[in-house]
């Protein structure tokens, strides 16, 4: 379920835009990144074609938002919320958040100022 967002500006417009784009490639790209850094999953090559393809698809999807720059934080928050219950280790959650905050830069967007990724009522 989508949570209430408490940010400045027209967040309802951003919510609609975030709803319209497919965030799955972004979620898959970041999961592949953090899986590649897990010792127990050393068979994952984070530089694989699969990962770079997902990154490109992710950037394309984020670009589909009319106000990509203004709505970037909402998009990142939604990705975090969608994957929160997949991450059962505090270090992994921190890793996921770090990768998430790097995402705008990877897609050649400006990083959003003050974006709170603690979106799951203390769960993540």
């Amino acid at each position: 379920m989508r949570r209430e967002r408490g940010r400045q500006g027209d967040s309802s417009s951003c919510e609609r835009q975030v709803d319209r784009v497919n965030l799955k490639p972004c979620e898959q790209h970041i999961m592949q990144r953090i899986m590649g850094e897990q010792e127990q999953y050393d068979s994952y090559d984070i530089r694989s074609t699969r990962s770079s393809d997902q990154q490109q698809r992710c950037c394309d999807e984020l670009n589909e938002m009319e106000n990509t720059q203004r709505c970037m934080c909402e998009a990142l928050q939604q990705i975090m919320e969608n994957q929160c219950d997949r991450l059962q280790d505090r270090q992994m959650v921190q890793q996921f958040k770090r990768e998430l905050m790097n995402l705008p830069q990877q897609c050649n967007f400006r990083a959003p100022q003050r974006c709170d990724l603690d979106v799951s009522g203390g769960r993540c």
Partner: antibody, heavy 118, light 111 residues
């Protein structure tokens, strides 16, 4: 080396309570989700409950919901299972299990036996 | 709730021969992040269960490479390329997409 040592099992009458404990060592206990899984004599495995590292999320199997309570003390590296209103069908070997961070159960204790009988 | 169904429930094996266990889930275990939340465990006689395969196809640390996992969605398979005497025990599949549920188990014993 990861070690999980369960205790607190024993013979108890139906309707009574019991509290299981699990002492963890060999890993950063307060970073990981922990689980209880049980196995009735001669039967298969049944997941019972889980607790996130920060106790921010507790999950229970339908069969124990409202009767069992999972908790943890990160300072003591300990996991607990408070079992109330015990039934004969709760008779099982109870395992303390560590999550690897990706919802996989990667280390298991030796188990503690709970027998509910009058 | 997701129901896990294993087959066969009993599997007599000959050392050196291959063996295969099937696991089917009542709904897809493929998450939107691209991973299948399906693990395999082995419980040897008198021991606690041990992790063999996670996320459908990833061998756990220390697990011999004769064990392999495959499948996606609702159909999964555990294969042992050449069974050894130490492989006897009960094999369980487990879904971790929604809480956690185990299959009934497959008892592997020597012929």
């Amino acid at each position: 080396e990861v070690q999980l040592v369960e205790s607190g099992g024993g013979l108890v009458q139906p309707g009574r309570s019991l509290r299981l404990s699990c002492a963890a060592s060999g890993f950063t206990f307060d970073d990981y989700t922990m689980h209880w899984v049980r196995q009735a004599p001669g039967k298969g495995l049944e997941w019972v409950s889980s607790i996130r590292w920060n106790s921010g999320n507790l999950d229970y199997a339908d069969s124990v919901k409202g009767r069992f309570t999972i908790s943890r003390d990160n300072a003591r590296h300990s996991l607990y299972l408070q079992m109330n209103s015990l039934r004969a069908e709760d008779t099982a070997l109870y395992y303390c299990v560590k999550d690897n961070g990706l919802r996989t159960l990667d280390f298991w204790g030796q188990g503690t036996l709970v027998t509910v009988s009058s | 709730d997701i129901v896990m169904t294993q087959s066969p429930l009993s599997l007599p094996v000959t050392p050196g021969e291959p063996a295969s266990i099937s696991c089917r889930s009542s709904q897809s275990l493929l998450h939107r992040n691209g991973y299948n939340y399906l693990d395999w465990y082995l419980q040897k006689p008198g021991q606690s269960p041990q992790l063999l395969i996670s996320l459908a196809s990833n061998r756990a640390s220390g697990v011999p490479d004769r064990f392999s996992g495959s499948g996606s969605g609702t159909d999964f398979t555990l294969k042992i390329s050449r069974v050894e005497a130490e492989d006897v025990g009960v094999y369980y599949c487990m879904q971790a997409l929604q809480t956690w549920t185990f299959g009934q188990g497959t008892k592997v014993e020597l012929k």
